[in-house]
Interface confidence: medium
């Protein structure tokens, strides 16, 4: 048994990374601990150190492989343990069975540009990363558009129910600096969470008129 | 050596409960996956479920609800619970285990269990 | 549920025949193990992931195929072959097993 609250959380990103977060109450301090992973019916382990993020959390990656390989599949059930150092042993600290793609993060969605902008709309595109092809097309994403004035917590979320990657922003001020932000999600996974907002894109519709001063 | 041997079949009226047991050596429950697979007499082979080696469990619809797969740590001993038991659950019942880093599928199989429904 | 289907259902062949068997999934399957039982015993695991022979078992036997259609071999039959193979698949729970070949001599 271990002292406190203990909270051990992991994403695949659907690929070749498991990215973890182990959280103590109380926790031993200045202590080496790793997450271990040991698929049930593969050929490989995996280890990555658990590094703090916060007084009471620890985090790391284990990366499988090259990073559009398809590490895991459906039916792939991993056990990840954290382990501290105790003296000259190992202490398993949290132990999960792990269902890969019941525990789904994709990447955030990369190379977003303007495809085509006016006074009062702007086409948007994008492309996700390192997303596995078992999704086929069950994937959805949302976005979000920050105005002037406002935070990115106020703007409103527009939801694509589908995998469609690109957008139509409409209704628009003329000669007005934006910033755009989209993620995604797959349809799969009992406890699948959408991936984190891309890096923001910036533009500016045009003016409403020829000639008028930018 | 990895070894599995598996007990508790028997006769059983329709309706009635039993309780496999699968009793593992060279190995500890705590780190391997362990499956539960049945083969009706004179038929193929029908998986049923698993316990990780997490504790967590999984199952095949067809008896999802009415078998159970436990264990006990302590005793290095896995358990199948069969509730409400018909006919058709009349089989031989194997627990197996997959292989180590070196080779996967169920390279390690108890002798089987002989579980007879029946009035 | 994956279907997996095993042609022959059984077939009998002389002591050093080259035998055949093959493995039709409904869909497409990744990681296909075949087993050999023999009257009265456990099952035992001959080829794991499609083409991979297990600890111990003869090179006579083989394995490969991918997709939907799988194929076992037995280069040449040994009076000890004489056994029902099943084919099964690892790819989507739950987990499924050909309905078996029963291999016999002439």
């Known amino acids: 048994a271990v002292n406190g609250t203990s909270q051990f959380t992991c994403f695949y990103n659907s690929r070749a990374n498991i990215s973890c977060v182990w959280s103590q109450d109380g926790a031993l301090q200045d202590t080496s601990c790793q997450v271990h992973a040991w698929p049930d019916r593969r050929r490989w382990n995996q280890t990555c150190e658990l590094l703090p993020v916060s007084q009471a959390s620890w985090a790391c990656n284990l990366i499988l492989g090259a990073p559009d390989s398809q590490k895991l599949t459906t039916v792939d059930i991993v056990t990840l343990r954290v382990l501290c150092r105790e003296g000259v042993r190992w202490r398993v600290m949290a132990i999960q069975d792990f269902k890969p793609f019941e525990n789904l993060r994709l990447m955030a969605p990369i190379s977003l540009q303007v495809v085509h902008v006016e006074t009062h709309r702007c086409n948007i595109s994008w492309e996700i990363s390192q997303a596995s092809h078992y999704f086929e097309r069950h994937l959805e994403f949302e976005a979000r558009t920050l105005s002037p004035g406002h935070t990115w917590e106020e703007a409103p979320l527009l939801t694509l129910k589908q995998k469609q990657e690109w957008i139509c922003l409409e209704t628009l001020t003329p000669d007005t600096q934006y910033e755009f932000q989209v993620r995604v999600k797959p349809l799969q996974g009992e406890f699948t969470t959408w991936s984190p907002w891309s890096q923001p894109l910036a533009f500016r519709t045009k003016p409403a008129a020829l000639g008028k001063d930018t | 050596e990895v070894q599995l041997l598996e007990s508790g079949g028997g006769l059983v009226q329709p309706g009635g409960s039993l309780r496999l047991s699968c009793a593992a050596s060279?190995?500890?429950?705590?780190?391997?996956?362990v499956h539960w697979i049945r083969q009706a007499p004179g038929k193929g082979l029908e998986w049923l479920g698993a316990?990780?080696?997490?504790?967590?469990?999984q199952y095949n619809a067809a008896v999802k609800g009415r078998f159970t797969i436990s264990r006990d740590n302590s005793k290095n001993t896995l358990y199948l619970q069969m509730n409400s038991l018909r006919a058709e659950d009349t089989a031989v019942y194997y627990c197996?285990?997959?292989?180590?880093?070196?080779?996967?599928?169920?390279?390690?199989w108890g002798q089987g269990t002989l579980v007879t429904v029946s009035s | 549920d994956i279907q997996m289907t095993q042609s022959p259902s059984s077939l009998s062949a002389s002591v050093g025949d080259r035998v055949t068997i093959t493995c039709q999934a409904s869909q497409s399957v990744s990681f296909l193990y075949w087993y050999q039982q023999r009257p009265g015993k456990a099952p035992r695991l001959l080829i794991y992931d499609t083409s991979n022979l297990a600890s111990g078992v003869p090179s006579r036997f083989s394995g490969s195929g991918s997709g939907t259609s799988y194929t076992f071999t037995i280069s040449s039959l040994q009076p000890e072959d004489i056994a029902t193979y099943y084919c099964q698949q690892w790819s989507t729970y739950p987990l499924t097993f050909g309905q078996g070949t029963k291999v016999e001599i002439k």
């Open positions: 197996a285990r997959a292989g180590d880093a070196n080779y996967d599928g169920f390279a390690y």
């Open positions: 060279g190995f500890s429950v705590t780190s391997y996956g």
């Open positions: 316990i990780w080696s997490g504790g967590s469990t």
